[in-house]
Amino acid sequence: SAPGEDEECGRVRDFVAKLANNTHQHVFDDLRGSVSLSWVGDSTGVILVLTTFHVPLVIMTFGQSKLYRSEDYGKNFKDITDLINNTFIRTEFGMAIGPENSGKVVLTAEVSGGSRGGRIFRSSDFAKNFVQTDLPFHPLTQMMYSPQNSDYLLALSTENGLWVSKNFGGKWEEIHKAVCLAKWGSDNTIFFTTYANGSCKADLGALELWRTSDLGKSFKTIGVKIYSFGLGGRFLFASVMADKDTTRRIHVSTDQGDTWSMAQLPSVGQEQFYSILAANDDMVFMHVDEPGDTGFGTIFTSDDRGIVYSKSLDRHLYTTTGGETDFTNVTSLRGVYITSVLSEDNSIQTMITFDQGGRWTHLRKPENSECDATAKNKNECSLHIHASYSISQKLNVPMAPLSEPNAVGIVIAHGSVGDAISVMVPDVYISDDGGYSWTKMLEGPHYYTILDSGGIIVAIEHSSRPINVIKFSTDEGQCWQTYTFTRDPIYFTGLASEPGARSMNISIWGFTESFLTSQWVSYTIDFKDILERNCEEKDYTIWLAHSTDPEDYEDGCILGYKEQFLRLRKSSVCQNGRDYVVTKQPSICLCSLEDFLCDFGYYRPENDSKCVEQPELKGHDLEFCLYGREEHLTTNGYRKIPGDKCQGGVNPVREVKDLKKKCTSNFLSPEKQNSKSN
């Protein structure tokens, strides 16, 4: 557990007066409909709020929307609906906010049935001004910004055309017809699938994958017989139909589709699916669905090329294509992921990995909690985390697990303590060491958010009744103060704070209901006066991440290195500040077998660090496809884990020889590709 010097609950002095002076109410002059909120840029304080109200009339639906802007983190809002000519904005497209601090915003308007095309409103000055632009097409999707250049936009039309703009939506050009799915890659590259015969659905499995690197001047077909494709980290994945039957396989490219290799993953049938759970530049977590309607599959982790995969976790809960999985990247500590498995008795259990999928284990039981009714042994049980699946089942779980990269080690989640995820009302648990140990933080379900890089945690009770109380903690959830932010309770709808957890402002959204009307209302609370001074060196303490045995020289070694962090002391009540940067000191570890994954044809028996040959491959030559050529692998069963930085120590031998033979099983070989220019 991270350091907790002050276990006693000391009250923050005079906090009621301090917060009262920093609580700002805004009542929106709106009939209650739906509300959506977007932050424009980072640390700009600019928030856009779009309220929409639908009145279903007999013949048609009458809609009204209003646009509001704040430039002080939500303390004050100005109605700027006139900047968009009081036009009704389509909420299903949301507000398309440009990348980084471009200040760009695109709103898609509702247009009348007979119009030639859609209409957008564009701003490139953080929504101070908008320009109306009529489109030569009706958009099917939200405008997508190129991550590299926010002037480049792409959109699909309702007629399946791929449209591109090079001047931030001022002028549009249709660069291809019959397009199913389009995505920006790196360097302003666009990848898209096309159909030849009837439609996207009809041609599923017979689609072509195309690439353009010059915004539609020229194209290259980089794949055929495509079912779908995805981008993750530096990997481009395509699921490709087999020649002879209805199965499909994953192929992977690390050079934008010029060359492909078949991933060493099981093929899947018509009713099954693949899903990229997480990907970075080092590796990918891939879920492969089990045959039949089982609701589970297997997680595989890739090598650094995305080709060779190790089985990571069996019976991984993932209900259906596009369905629910609890897979969660714990962003507050490197290498940590949480997910759910469907155990042999079909109960749902939470598992955690601290080494990027190498080993999975149950979550340790919080010391201040009893085992619930799901536990067979009342003294032995685990913490089980509620995530997407529980939310989809409409359990009393208002929020998914929360972690932030700059709030090191902190994980907050709803959970139950037993042998499995329970249907009883959950409590909120916190870990301050990235998931190794847990404590019950709040009784019952709550909304929660992290402010000031972990310096403050804010929570609101999840209730069907109106609320007027917010809770906050300045010591990572050990002690809580309550503040009544309004005399008149509101029906709470959400907490909003600036993404990145650096802000000290929190907005409480809800609506008031009187006899005749209901109105949107927000309360923005600034905690700057609670944390009255800036943190100094003495407020921080050194913490070794992943530490489980301080006596061991290799303690804290994960993926070949250990990291020491400067962590805010729990007893320090001070501001990390908006410019806070996580201070960490890495040190390289000696290599052990734990730093290697099992190579193609090998697996790790449970509770063993040695890789052994898969029985069905014993005595066979290990040959696999790489870039459309057949390779012969000479290995003693180990391959370095992607991203592992260990040096010295154990060093297993590994050699790959090119057999100079074509792979007949690779459907994406270079000779099946072609180029064309517009």
Epitope: D293, D345, N346, Y389, Q393, V423, M424, V425
Partner: antibody, heavy 121, light 109 residues
């Protein structure tokens, strides 16, 4: 120990709506669990009607879905069944029951003693 | 929907004998999703077995469940006088509807 008690009229006219309530004691409905209704026509087997979670999430038997509404009132610690447009085929003993603690399972651990509802004019 | 067929419809046995009741599903059911109930005249059903083989709280160990896929069995090793009743199996897979078998009546011979 949780106890469940069904209540409601024993006689309902055809085409009318059958309304039953299940009062729960010894456990707060708002603390969780799925709560269900099962019926048993005289001399016949059991038929699951539907289940509800305290937050209002419901599952219904597709064969009855168009006629069934199950609701929950946490303030009174009870849940209710409404079955519209009844016919003689809806004559049965109606049981309320509580599901197990694990998410994703729907067997019934605790049962009320049942109430006979006859549909007749 | 999954149809459960119980056999025999009636089982006539004497106290002390072994009773074997069968429940067959129209399609495969995960063993974790099968439960058995006992019902005596004028009473509500009582949960005996869940997860095909786990005994509910307070159920004597003469009751045991087994099976997987489409074939499940409830066994009463030595019938006691209070065991004469109707027994129902129930499947509660991931998705509704959750269905019961037609029942097997165990009567005194």
């Amino acid at each position: 120990q949780v106890q469940l008690q069904e209540s409601g009229p024993g006689l309902v006219k055809p085409s009318e709506t059958l309304s039953l309530t299940c009062a729960v004691s010894g456990y707060s409905i708002s603390s969780g669990y799925y709560w269900g209704w099962i019926r048993q026509p005289p001399g016949k087997g059991l038929e699951w009607i539907g289940s509800i979670y305290h937050s209002g999430n419901t599952y219904y038997n597709p064969s009855l879905k168009s006629r069934v509404t199950i609701s929950v009132d946490t303030s009174k610690n009870q849940f209710s069944l409404k079955l519209s447009s009844v016919t003689a085929a809806d004559t049965a003993v109606y049981y309320c029951a509580r599901g197990p603690p694990e998410l994703g399972k729907m067997y019934f651990q605790h049962w009320g003693q049942g109430t006979l509802v006859t549909v007749s004019s | 929907e999954i149809v459960l067929t119980q056999s025999p419809g009636t089982l006539s046995l004497s106290p002390g004998e072994r009773a074997t009741l069968s429940c067959r599903a129209s399609q495969s059911v995960s063993s974790s999703y099968l439960a058995w109930y006992q019902q005596k005249p004028g009473q509500a059903p009582r949960l005996l077995i869940y997860g095909a083989s786990s005994r509910a709280t307070g159920i004597p160990d003469r009751f045991s469940g087994s099976g997987s896929g489409t074939d499940f069995t409830l066994t009463i090793s030595r019938l006691e006088p209070e065991d004469f009743a109707v027994y129902y199996c129930q499947q509660h897979g991931r998705l509704p509807p959750w269905t019961f078998g037609g029942g097997t009546k165990v009567e005194i011979k």
